[in-house]
Interface confidence: medium
């Protein structure tokens, strides 16, 4: 730490991991345990952010940066900083305020956290359904039917099914 | 520039009390301690203490409590060392030093003798 | 209290020799408060090198320090003649402050 020396406020001299200490000390103190200063001049030190719970661990404070948590198993982080846990779910499923739910026909989800998404609307684009979409797949377009040469085969687009996602048979 | 100018050279008998001046120049007198060290004829240094130049407040080391005060005259930017009940013991050079926010003695004086002889 | 020990306490080197002198602490010592003067014969102490490893206004380049926990050291990379002089380290720990006995440094 390369202090430029000042004359009208020395608490300015102070590296990250203490605090100015100015009044009563004249000088500036390391940051107590369990706390820290991540830039110079600070007149107190942070309390350092404990990972309880479902977060965990995934940086220890030092008296220079806070401590960075991420989420135990079965769990992602949401917000800046992970600051909240949300609850996994499986591929094809999307968290609602009763839990983790199926992804319903014409929508998918090919993580464990976020919402089911429309499946892609192959038509909208001029093309035509390469290979059909499941609760945890987006559907594969492939090219238009008149890209096709003569005597090709095309799938044709799946009618409405009971079962998500799945041609009838 | 910072300076810090002692009170010249003592020669006391022992029982008697001396009292050392420090002045500081060149830089806001409050802002900064004030620590006061000894060194012996060919010996190296002790931390005898400091004074608080913003609450006046003094602290001396274990080796320096009893007949040993620090005080300040703000107004002048001096601070002081008196020994009373002068020691033979006590013959060495006595040198304020501007106590650096990071625990370092950044300004010395010139160092003042104080010699104890009967 | 803190107690610096420094060795050697006398060493002696030619000009253009490289020496390197030691200061370990009984406890450790975070590296920001670790100090380093120089005092010539019959001259007040300067602060020659702070925080460890900063060398002070007007230090020639040829000093350098480096150190963590309880031992510390101050190299000078090629002697000089006006290098010759007692080099007291110093911490701040605990509201004390400790010295060093010193390492003087003579040049042949």
């Known amino acids: 730490f390369e202090r430029t020396r000042s004359l009208q406020d020395p608490c300015s001299n102070c590296p990250a991991g203490t605090f100015c200490d100015n009044n009563r000390n004249q000088i500036c103190s390391p940051c107590p345990p369990n706390s820290f200063s991540s830039a110079g001049g600070q007149r107190t030190c942070d309390i350092c952010r404990q990972c309880k719970g479902v977060f965990r661990t995934r940086k220890e404070c030092s008296s220079t940066s806070n401590a960075e948590c991420d989420c135990t198993p079965g769990f992602h982080c949401l917000g800046a900083g992970c600051s909240m846990c949300e609850q996994d779910c499986k591929q094809g499923q999307e968290l609602t305020k009763k839990g983790c739910k199926d992804c319903c026909f014409g929508t998918f989800n090919d993580q464990k956290r976020g919402i089911c998404r429309p499946w892609t609307n192959c038509s909208l684009d001029g093309k035509s359904v390469l290979v059909n979409g499941t609760k945890e797949r987006d559907v594969v377009c492939g090219p238009s039917p008149a890209d096709l040469s003569p005597g090709a085969s095309s799938v044709t687009p799946p009618a409405p099914a009971r079962e998500p996602g799945h041609s009838p048979q | 520039q910072i300076q810090l100018v002692q009170s010249g050279p003592e020669l006391k008998k022992p029982g008697e009390t001396v009292k050392i001046s420090c002045k500081a120049s060149g830089y806001t007198f409050t802002n900064y301690g004030m620590n006061w060290v000894k060194q012996a004829p060919g010996k190296g240094f002790k931390w005898m203490g400091w004074?608080?130049?913003?609450?006046?407040?003094?602290t001396y080391a274990d080796d320096f409590k009893g007949r040993f005060a620090f005080s300040l005259e703000i107004s002048a930017s001096t601070a002081y060392l008196q020994i009373n009940n002068l020691k033979n013991e006590d013959t060495a050079t006595y040198f304020c030093?501007?106590?650096?926010?990071?625990?370092?003695?950044?300004?010395w004086g010139q160092g003042t003798s104080v010699t104890v002889s009967s | 209290e803190n107690v610096l020990t420094q060795s050697p306490a006398i060493m002696s080197a030619s000009p253009g020799e490289k020496v390197t002198m030691t200061c370990r602490a009984s406890s450790s010592v975070s590296s920001s408060y670790l100090h380093w003067y120089q005092q010539k014969s019959g001259a007040s102490p300067k602060l020659w090198i702070y925080?460890?490893?900063n060398l002070a206004s007007g230090v020639p380049a040829r000093f350098s320090g480096s150190g963590s926990g309880t031992s510390y050291s101050l190299t000078i990379s090629s002697v000089e003649a006006e290098d010759a002089a007692t080099y007291y380290c110093?911490?701040?720990?605990?509201?004390?402050?400790?010295f060093g006995g010193g390492t003087k440094l003579e040049i042949k």
């Open positions: 110093q911490q701040y720990s605990a509201y004390l402050y400790t």
């Open positions: 004074i608080n130049t913003y609450t006046g407040e003094p």
């Open positions: 030093a501007r106590r650096d926010y990071l625990g370092a003695m950044d300004y």
């Open positions: 925080s460890t490893s």
